[in-house]
């Protein structure tokens, strides 16, 4: 997130520093489009991957286990609900739980940012050419860092599973079990400028199938790479920090225009797993009253 040396409140009667809001939104859009974009656009496939990785591409089965003793109907209802077929279809891709952190001064190879991530609150967008319509700062950056836009394919020899635990009054388990198909493409790690190693905890057996136009010296920017050990994960920003990082006051209500500026940051924070603590895969190591999901709001 950007850090500004300029005081926000005294300079902006409107309660929003629009320069900072635009620049911050653009930064988060660059992160997202670097990971999911291709050839100056966000393809349907890339958009689908983004939705999948933030967990809203399909209906998920949620198991709710309550700590208290009473057994009302709703406690077991979710286990018996019928779920739509698309939850189980085979075109699942691996849902990594590794951070996608970023540093604000990193020159990401940005992509075209079409108005797909956070649409305008007005309904009339019919007159816009989708190739021209980046919308409110969602624009098409050039390749400043000189890195080619290469995606890696991943082959997996086993079913992969991501389990997020939120342990509180009631324990909620969101289980997503997905099988990546060989040759499927994964988004790039925006933060890695040197070849990182594959994490030892990764359940992907190997990385393969690099595009032939990728230079030998270029780092592979696969979705499954662990972050470099000397880098910090992107901070989990709560509501106040999200607002101030966009040059917005925290005492005034948001209108739709102002909220629109925040959308890429919110999506990027979800996608980067910024607010998830990655606990050990051994369930026994999770203390009964700790949170693997930080309270961000």
């Amino acid at each position: 997130f950007p850090q500004t040396t300029e005081k926000i409140s005294p300079n902006w009667e409107s309660g929003i520093n629009v320069d900072l809001a635009i620049s911050t939104r653009q930064y988060h859009l660059q992160q997202l489009f670097y990971r999911y974009g291709e050839n100056n656009s966000l393809s349907v496939e890339g958009f689908r991957k983004l939705l999948q990785n933030i967990g809203i591409d399909k209906i998920k089965r949620i198991h709710i286990h309550h700590d208290h003793d009473h057994h009302s109907d709703h406690e077991h209802h979710s286990d018996h609900e019928r779920h739509s077929d698309h939850e189980h279809h085979s075109e699942h891709e691996h849902h990594s739980d590794h951070d996608h952190h970023s540093h604000h001064n990193h020159a990401a190879s940005g992509k075209n940012k079409r108005k797909a991530l956070c649409p305008d609150h007005d309904s009339d967008s019919s007159g816009k050419d989708p190739r021209n319509s980046q919308g409110k700062g969602a624009h098409r950056p050039e390749h400043a860092s000189g890195r080619r836009n290469v995606k890696d394919s991943v082959s997996a020899s086993e079913v992969t599973s991501t389990v997020y635990n939120t342990v509180s009054e009631g324990t909620h388990f969101l289980e997503t079990i997905e099988t990546p198909r060989p040759g499927k493409l994964f988004p790039k790690d925006v933060s890695s400028s040197t070849p990182p190693s594959v994490t030892s905890k990764s359940r992907v057996s190997r990385l393969a199938g690099r595009k032939t136009n990728e230079s030998v010296s270029e780092p592979r920017k696969g979705f499954m790479y662990s972050r470099n050990t000397n880098e910090n994960p992107q901070e989990c920003f709560n509501a106040s920090k999200l607002l101030t990082s966009h040059g917005m006051g925290i005492q005034v209500p948001l209108n739709a225009t102002e909220f629109n500026y925040l959308c890429p940051a919110i999506i990027n924070q979800i996608d980067a797993r910024s607010c998830l603590i990655h606990t050990s895969e051994k369930k026994a190591e999770i203390p009964p009253k700790t949170y693997s999901l930080q309270i961000a709001w």
Epitope: V18, Q134, G135, T257
Partner: antibody, heavy 113, light 107 residues
Amino acid sequence: QVQLKQSGPGLVQPSQSLSITCTVSGFSLTSYGVHWVRQSPGKGLEWLGVIWTGGTTDYNAAFKSRLSISKDNSKSQVFFKMNSLQANDTAIYYCARGPSSYWGQGTLVTVSA
Amino acid sequence: DIVMTQSQKFMSTSVGDRVSVTCKASQNVDTNVVWYQQKPGQSPKALIHSTSYRYSGVPDRFTGSGSGTDFTLTISNVQSEDLAEYFCQQYNNYPWTFGGGTKLEIK
């Protein structure tokens, strides 16, 4: 106090390149994008391009082939270079933190032999 | 590119009057419009952003309105120091584009 100060030549020969440096103070280039705009009597105000916080750039397609914007965050400087100038590129060139009131003082560039 | 049209190149008004400068976008730009005031020999000064948000230090006699394609800058109780050229600009789509300007003359 937010300021943008421009330095660059006032006269450029036809077919030569124009280089302008915009030195900013009161804010960080890692937090704000810096835009370039020019103004001429014939064409009014034209947005030329921007360099974003991470170093990526967006250019007006009409100028993309001959325009380059770069920066040095540590020196708080943004560098503007336009190649192959012609007489109709005569204008006042501004750097700005746009879309705000924070604009440079402008550099009047005359393209003439 | 989005064309921002300010149909009136010149407007004449008197001190104390109310005047409205209009700007029309060739396609929807939501509320992403800035109004600038430029006095001779000076850089443009932003008055309004996001169609209706007044910048700090801008007198409250300047108000902005509109959405989509039609936008208006209204100056109520015009003062002699308001003699200037006024530009609209959209920042919804790149390239950002400006209106041709409206020069306000004081009778």
